[in-house]
């Protein structure tokens, strides 16, 4: 066992001479992003104050390619890198094409309306006038490709004029536009060469030891890894912590059960019920507030102040009033919960599916004519699953080195 331990320690650290280095650098696991949209069936009725009705469309599946660049080894046992992602539509795995039309809330109009609720009435009336002139409405009919990767919208220019420096978009707006062909920030992580217990843990993200999106030190902490590998020799008492630039926060998953993936022993980690709980139910989350109902997390502070919320798909594990407020939602543990299956000896994921939902808080705002009589509601826009499973040559090598070899050595 100590010989095996030595082998593991030697081969999991981030070091060009280690077996797993190339696996860390260019993840050989095929990752897929499956996106499900909530097609709004009754936009006119919502504007009159009726309950929203949605229909899930999808999945629209993309192959996700990741590669690390600007890899710099520092002299404090850390390595810095940028990880770039590109997405390629997979028609054969998808239920529909990127040219499918989806009726969706107009995030720019409805988001701006909620953001301006407490602004002077004059500004709100100017916005109404602008929206009318520009033909901007509360709901839009756009293609999947446009929603994902961006569409030209004159409102982007208008928002940049009235709210300078707040909006990360120029000319085009798309929900996943910032992810494609771009990096998720500069990560500096421990290599484990000098101290294996800190391997993969994030030292800094974009040069920061903590973020300032939230209202408490605990919520602002950058904890865990960058979300791809974890320290070796896990036990059922271990938790799986990682910093997610997309959620602008650290997340902690808990051990659920042991299992086997393609002959390799694994630990399954899942989201605790408290992950998106509000501060009154789970006090440590108070720093993520102001909160609405429990089970959704306000990400407006890191998403250009738009009233966007992150949750489990279909408001799984959230306050039931959220799913009841929208017709067409059916939360289901099997279909909508996330998991990571980790090989506990190495801390390397074998099979995972991270599922999250993005929703928009919308309501009628006095002075913004386009909001009509919309009753306050958190309306799901889409949910996605980022999934990957080790396969092929990588799996074979992994199985040989970490399952077969130790068994042979044991005997």
């Amino acid at each position: 066992p100590s010989l095996i331990k030595q082998q593991v320690l030697k081969n999991v650290r981030i070091d060009p001479s280690s077996l797993s280095f190339n696996m860390w650098k260019e993840i050989p696991i095929p990752f897929y992003l499956s996106v499900y949209f909530f097609d709004v069936m009754n936009p006119s009725e919502i504007l009159k104050g009726e309950k929203p009705q949605v229909r899930e469309r999808g999945p629209y599946v993309y192959r996700e390619f990741r590669h690390k660049s600007n890899i710099t080894f520092n002299n404090n046992d850390t390595v810095s890198f940028l990880e770039y992602r590109t997405f390629q539509f997979q028609p054969s795995k998808s239920h529909g094409s990127e040219s499918d039309y989806i009726v969706m809330p107009n995030i720019l109009v409805l988001g701006a309306a909620v953001m301006m609720e407490n602004k002077p009435m004059t500004l709100k009336l100017i916005m109404t006038l602008a929206f009318t002139t520009l033909g901007e409405r509360a709901f839009m009919n756009r293609t999947v490709g446009e929603i994902m990767w961006g569409y030209k919208d004159p409102l982007v220019n208008l928002i940049n004029k009235y709210f300078p420096g707040m909006f990360p978009f120029k000319d085009k707006f798309g929900l996943f536009a910032e992810l494609n062909n771009s990096d998720s920030g500069l990560f500096t992580v421990f290599t484990g060469v000098q101290n294996i217990s800190r391997i993969h843990l994030v030292d800094k993200w974009n040069g920061l030891s903590k973020v300032d999106f939230w209202h408490s030190d605990q919520c602002n902490m950058i904890n865990g890894t960058s979300g791809q590998m974890w320290p070796p020799f896990m036990t059922p008492e271990s938790s799986l912590e990682f910093y997610s630039p997309e959620a602008c926060r650290s997340m902690k998953l808990m051990y659920k059960e042991s299992g086997v993936f393609e002959g390799i022993p694994t630990y399954r980690f899942v989201a605790p019920k408290t992950l998106f709980a509000n501060g009154s139910i789970y006090p440590p989350n108070e720093g993520f507030c102001p909160c609405l109902e429990s089970g959704i997390q306000n990400v407006s502070t890191c998403r250009f102040s738009a009233p966007l919320f992150l949750s489990h798909p279909h408001f799984l594990n959230a306050d039931p009033v959220l799913a009841e407020a929208v017709t067409g939602l059916h939360p289901n543990q099997e279909a909508h919960s996330l998991f990571l299956d980790i090989h506990p000896v190495t801390g390397i994921p074998m099979n995972c599916s991270v599922k999250l939902q993005l929703s928009l808080y919308m309501k009628s705002v006095a002075g913004i004519g386009q909001t009509g009589k919309i009753e306050p509601v958190v309306l799901p826009l889409l949910w996605f699953a980022e999934s990957g499973a080790m396969e092929g040559e990588t799996l074979h090598t992994f199985y040989t080195q970490l399952v077969l070899m130790p068994k042979v050595m044991h005997y």
Epitope: I126, L134, L158
Partner: antibody
């Protein structure tokens, strides 16, 4: 179907005041913003101001600020525009318009009110 | 003078194709979408095109709109006598914080 019905033509002397009306029919008045526009000879259309009848909030184009007052009477579903200190260059057709919720641009217009300013 | 510049008149024979231009600047057409209004003789203006290239409800598919840089255009194919009217372009102007219009083009069907 929403319609805007405007009051008839008016003739005024320079320095006088004119008040024209615009009644919304076919739907709930307070669900619509009312916009006022001027069509003067050789000047094209110009936006003058708007009102949200729900709470009587208004804004005006800089050019018309101070001389124009837009009001609304929710009991009669009518918006009004008053122009004071009339000058000969105020001779124009004045339109009220709205955008039905969910539509784009000014998609419902009144027929216009001709105002002639002449001594 | 109107903020947006339109030729005062245009003409065409029935069945022909006519195009109207509308010229602006970076603070209006250059940054934002364009609407077109049609005003038939003795009637109120009517929304014809919105968001540059979208026909308003009830507008025939003979009408199309486009934009390039700080200029926009409206085209009518298969000209008909009932198209005889004034055509106004409009856009948001972020230096004036309001919509601006052209002086209108009077179309005569020969």
């Amino acid at each position: 179907e929403v319609q805007l019905v405007q009051s008839g033509a008016e003739v005024r002397k320079p320095g006088a005041t004119v008040k024209i009306s615009c009644k919304l029919t076919g739907d709930t008045f307070t669900d619509y913003f009312i916009f006022w526009l001027q069509l003067a000879p050789g000047k094209g259309l110009q936006w003058m101001g708007l009102i949200d009848p729900k709470d009587a909030q208004t804004i005006y184009a800089e050019k018309f600020q101070g001389r124009v007052a837009i009001t609304a009477d929710t009991s009669t579903d009518t918006a009004y525009m008053e122009v004071s200190s009339l000058r000969s260059e105020d001779t124009a057709v004045y339109y009220c318009a709205t955008d039905s919720v969910g539509a784009a641009g000014f998609d419902v217009w009144g027929r216009g009110t001709m105002v002639t300013v002449s001594s | 003078l109107p903020v947006l510049t339109q030729p005062p008149s245009a003409s065409g024979a029935p069945g022909q194709r006519v195009t109207f231009s509308c010229s602006g600047s970076g603070s209006n057409i250059g940054s934002y979408t364009v609407n077109w209004y049609q005003q038939l003789p003795g009637a109120a203006p009517r929304l014809l095109m919105h968001t540059t290239d979208q026909r308003a409800s009830g507008a025939p598919d003979r009408f199309s709109g486009s934009k390039s840089g700080t200029s926009a255009s409206l085209a009518i194919t298969g000209l008909q006598s009932e198209d005889e009217a004034d055509y106004f372009c409009a856009a948001w102007d972020d230096s004036l914080d309001g919509p601006v219009f052209g002086g209108g083009t009077k179309l005569t069907v020969l």
